[in-house]
Interface confidence: low
């Protein structure tokens, strides 16, 4: 399941990955060192009945209709770490590969 | 992240595992051989700022909040398989480990 | 370092407002979430509010909503509490303290500010 | 909301005691609790962060443990500046919930 991508001009209105850039600097989170920004991107779209699942679970889901389930949502199914260089809570500046930072495939669950 | 286990009586409305019985008979599964039915278990709840999230790049998503971003969503973030006994498509018996079958796990992402 | 400084208590009469600010200086603001704790005399510690480093996300205890507003000001680096239809039981001191959510929590208080409800 | 339970809700111990607080949580909530130390008209000093990670500049006799729902402060040589009251804080979900405060006195 290779999952969709999409940019801001699609039409596409199924579960799809949307770049995204995150700029820690807009957030002022200001004990990250770097990388000040980096490509985060993001999952958006509708589920639609048996599109994109990454589970047969959420194809069960669906059928047995328990209450409360709200049916499966678009979110990722991927996901890769990135490596930072920050300041921990003592001031000692930490260089480490952070994980679930990139989303590299959305689907639904 | 240990997630939350509720049951049909629990009044948790943030996100949570809730105890599910998928039974392949009730839904005329007649190809499956074994098991008739199993715990399969599901996700439901709202997902509240930070409450259970999976990644950092929830978080980072919210804070960003682009176009079309739905907010995390309830989703099974820990999924295990089930043995089972079936009939393929060419009608031959296959046991097999089946994944994405159990959920473990609920969380935000 | 770190420091916040309250300033906004004070006597007040059932039914009166007072609004508590908490102004932040020697780390960036606009990064953190921001709560308001409270402490009744010889009681324990009350969460009473929260809100995001963006205001986007805000939240209250029970026994505040709706009669308690927090906002912040982070061109100010400020933060604030007014408190309305005051009662009783809102006599406590008020704190003010930083978020850094995640794994960090709360790390840092202010020096708390007394406000008290009587006729 | 989630519950803390915080216990003994006070101990006499004398300087040079090992002093041990616990909290319960009413559900799982990771390791995302800290143990705070006040004073008589002071604000709140956090003295551990994470369940177990030690705030910057806290001397190294405290320390915590615990994840999910069960969580422990240990003082292991009770110092005379430590009398004091000491609560636990769950910032896992709103609302923020605090333990309801363990008070140390001097035997």
């Known amino acids: 399941n290779l999952g969709l991508d999409c940019d801001e001009h699609s039409s596409e209105s199924r579960c799809c990955r949307y770049p995204l850039t995150v700029d820690f600097e807009a957030f002022g989170w200001d004990w990250i060192i770097a990388p000040k920004r980096y490509k985060a991107n993001y999952c958006s779209g509708q589920c639609e009945y048996m599109f994109m699942q990454k589970y047969p679970h959420t194809h069960l889901v669906q059928q047995a209709n328990p209450r409360g389930s709200a049916g499966p949502c678009c979110t990722p199914t991927k996901m890769s770490p990135i490596n930072m260089l920050y300041f921990n809570d003592k001031q000692q500046i930490i260089y480490g590969k952070i994980p679930g930072m990139v989303v590299d495939r959305c689907g639904c669950s | 992240n240990l997630g939350l286990d509720c049951d049909e009586h629990s009044s948790e409305s943030r996100c949570c595992r809730y105890p599910l019985t998928v039974d392949f008979e009730a839904f005329g599964w007649d190809w499956i051989i074994a098991p008739k039915r199993y715990k399969a278990n599901y996700c439901s709840g709202q997902c509240e700022y930070m409450f259970m999230q999976k990644y950092p790049h929830t978080h980072l998503v919210q804070q960003a909040n682009p176009r079309g971003s739905a907010g995390p969503c309830c989703t099974p973030t820990k999924m295990s398989p089930i043995n089972m006994l079936y009939f393929n498509d060419k009608q031959q018996i296959i046991y097999g480990k089946i994944p994405g079958m159990v959920v473990d796990r609920c969380g935000c992402s | 370092q770190v420091q916040l400084v309250q300033s906004g208590g004070g006597l007040v009469k059932p039914g009166g407002s007072l609004r508590l600010s908490c102004a932040a200086s020697?780390?960036?603001?606009?990064?953190?979430?921001m709560n308001w704790v409270r402490q009744a005399p010889g009681k324990g510690l009350e969460w009473v509010s929260s809100?995001?480093?963006?205001?986007?996300?805000?939240y209250y205890a029970d026994s505040v909503k709706g009669r308690f507003t927090i906002s912040r000001d982070n061109a100010k680096n400020s933060l604030y509490l007014q408190m309305n239809s005051l009662r009783a039981e809102d006599t406590a001191v008020y704190y003010c303290?930083?978020?850094?959510?995640?794994?960090?929590?709360?790390?840092?208080w202010g020096q708390g500010t007394t406000v008290t409800v009587s006729s | 909301a989630i519950q803390m339970t915080q216990s003994p809700s006070s101990l006499s111990a004398s300087v040079g005691d090992r002093v041990t607080i616990t909290c319960r949580a009413s559900?799982?909530?990771?390791?995302?609790l800290g143990w705070y130390q006040q004073k008589p008209g002071k604000a709140p000093k956090r003295l551990i962060y994470?369940?177990?990670s030690l705030q910057s500049g806290v001397p190294s006799r405290f320390s915590g443990s615990g994840s999910g729902t069960e969580f422990t402060l240990t003082i292991s040589s009770l110092q005379p500046e430590d009398f004091a009251t000491y609560y636990c804080?769950?910032?896992?979900?709103?609302?923020?919930?605090f333990g309801q405060g363990t008070k140390v006195e001097i035997k």
């Open positions: 994470a369940a177990s």
């Open positions: 804080l769950q910032h896992n979900s709103y609302p923020y919930t």
């Open positions: 809100i995001s480093s963006s205001s986007s996300y805000i």
């Open positions: 559900q799982g909530i990771r390791n995302d």
């Open positions: 020697g780390f960036t603001f606009s990064s953190y979430s």
């Open positions: 303290a930083r978020d850094r959510g995640y794994t960090f929590g709360v790390d840092y």
